[in-house]
Interface confidence: medium
């Protein structure tokens, strides 16, 4: 039995819902009560959700999934799974048996939008061309790790003296924190940017010294 | 409640046919597969083929391809089987079954019938 | 098509003894994906027909005491009877639905002293 689903990832917005795409050509004559369809996390093959003897079986997956229960006699077994957390990223299995069975694996990719970056100075005051400053800039409650990119006034990338640290929280969400260590010049501006990779969504900020 | 009401013996000459029937009732009987299994005196289950009542597709074992006719009723909701050519080898209980769904276990089984080829 | 070999193919107990009983399968019925094997066992009692006991290798058919146990997975699979009662004596049959056509397993009787 051929089991269809999407090739790439689907991205879901924490806290959003997500469809998890699946379909089967069902036979002529095919009848609900033949099915049994099961959707597993690939790897551990726990129970998401599953539908038997013409019966919704139910969410086995904290009760944030459903199926389209109207749409299952077409071939569409396809999973909506609400209120989508970073532990939910990975790989799903869609596994139908009628008479013959099959399966196909699609993955969830989660993302989460990085809020625009602060910037910080230390020091803050009286500074005068070449001295050394530190420029923090934080961004806050992204998923997946960041990218962070520094550059000048004038776009030219600044990859030295960079330190650049990224800590979960509870929820799997990035805070990310990156230090550029820099001699002033006569006077300048610098930039940050950071990055999601999955959205290519990105925040960025700058400070000038003068 | 699912039964599966089966046809009782039939004592028939060698090279002759015989028609087994199952009666279905419980369920929609065009939802589901209906099995059909032989067991030879002090021998074990031979799965003879499926037929499917909704459309009347097919699904035979090769060893029976020419021995075993399978039909439907709807009206009735009976399954029938067709064995032809009879031999002394054919001397056998037949059993109808039913899968939970799809092409699963058998969860339900007809009582048998009994086919005895004498001459 | 995959031949399911059975052992012992008879066997005599007596009240309140474990037995185990082995069904042995020519390919994998292992299932990769979901990780399940499609192996099921049946109770057939004198005169009657089959009861489905056992399916998907070791989950138990709804109403079917809990003395009863499958185990196994790919090609090697067991049926346990922790403690036999008079009830059970009957021939069990194992049976795979991973592919076409359908087998059963020749079969082991058992007995009662």
């Known amino acids: 039995l051929e089991v269809q689903v999407p090739e790439d990832p689907v991205v879901a917005l924490v806290g959003t819902d997500a469809t998890l795409c699946c379909s089967f050509s069902p036979e002529p004559g095919f009848s609900l009560a033949q099915l049994n369809l099961i959707w597993q996390l690939t790897d551990t093959k726990q129970l998401v959700h599953s539908f038997a003897e013409g019966q919704d079986q139910g969410s086995a997956y904290a009760n944030r999934t459903a199926l389209f229960p109207d749409l299952l006699a077409q071939g569409n077994a396809s999973l909506r799974l609400q209120r989508v957390r970073v532990a939910d990223e990975g790989s799903f299995t869609c596994f139908v048996s009628i008479r013959d069975f099959g399966s196909a694996a699609v993955s969830l990719q989660v993302a989460a939008p990085y809020s625009k970056p602060s910037m910080t100075l230390e020091p803050n005051k009286d500074l005068r061309p070449g001295d050394t400053v530190t420029i923090t800039c934080s961004s806050y409650q992204g998923y997946p790790e960041a990218e962070v990119f520094w550059q000048d006034g004038q776009g030219v990338p600044l990859t030295g003296n960079v330190t650049t640290s990224q800590m979960a929280n509870e929820q799997g969400l990035f805070d990310v924190h990156s230090i550029l260590r820099v001699v002033l010049g006569a006077n300048g501006t610098y930039s940050c940017l950071v990055r999601n990779p999955v959205l290519q969504q990105d925040a960025h900020s700058s400070v000038t010294i003068t | 409640e699912v039964q599966l009401e089966q046809s009782g013996p039939d004592l028939v000459k060698p090279g002759a046919s015989v028609k087994l029937s199952c009666k279905a009732s419980?369920?929609?009987?065009?939802?589901?597969?209906i099995n059909w299994v032989r067991q030879r005196p002090e021998q074990g289950l031979e799965w003879i083929g499926w037929?499917?009542?909704?459309?009347?597709?097919?699904k035979y074992d090769e060893t029976f391809k020419d021995k075993a006719t399978l039909t439907t009723d709807k009206s009735s909701s009976t399954a029938y089987m067709q064995l032809s050519r009879l031999t002394s080898e054919d001397s056998a209980v037949y059993f109808c079954?039913?899968?939970?769904?799809?092409?699963?276990?058998?969860?339900?089984w007809g009582q048998g019938t009994l086919v005895s080829v004498s001459a | 098509d995959i031949v399911l070999t059975q052992s012992p193919s008879s066997l005599t107990v007596s009240v309140g003894e474990k037995v185990t009983m082995s069904c042995k399968s020519s390919?994998?019925?292992?299932?990769?994906?979901?990780?399940?094997?499609?192996l099921a066992w049946y109770q057939q009692k004198p005169g009657q027909s089959p009861k489905l006991l056992i399916y998907?290798?070791?989950t138990r058919e709804s109403g079917v005491p809990d003395r009863f146990t499958g185990s196994g997975s790919g090609t090697d699979f067991t049926l346990t009877i922790s403690s036999v009662k008079a009830e059970d004596l009957a021939v069990y049959f194992c049976?795979?639905?991973?592919?076409?056509?359908?087998?059963f397993g020749g079969g082991t009787k058992l007995e009662i002293k």
């Open positions: 390919q994998s019925l292992l299932y990769n994906t979901i990780q399940r094997s499609y």
């Open positions: 037929i499917f009542p909704g459309d009347g597709s097919t």
């Open positions: 998907w290798a070791s």
């Open positions: 419980g369920y929609t009987f065009t939802d589901f597969d």
């Open positions: 079954a039913r899968p939970r769904y799809g092409g699963s276990w058998f969860a339900y």
């Open positions: 049976q795979q639905n991973y592919q076409y056509p359908w087998t």
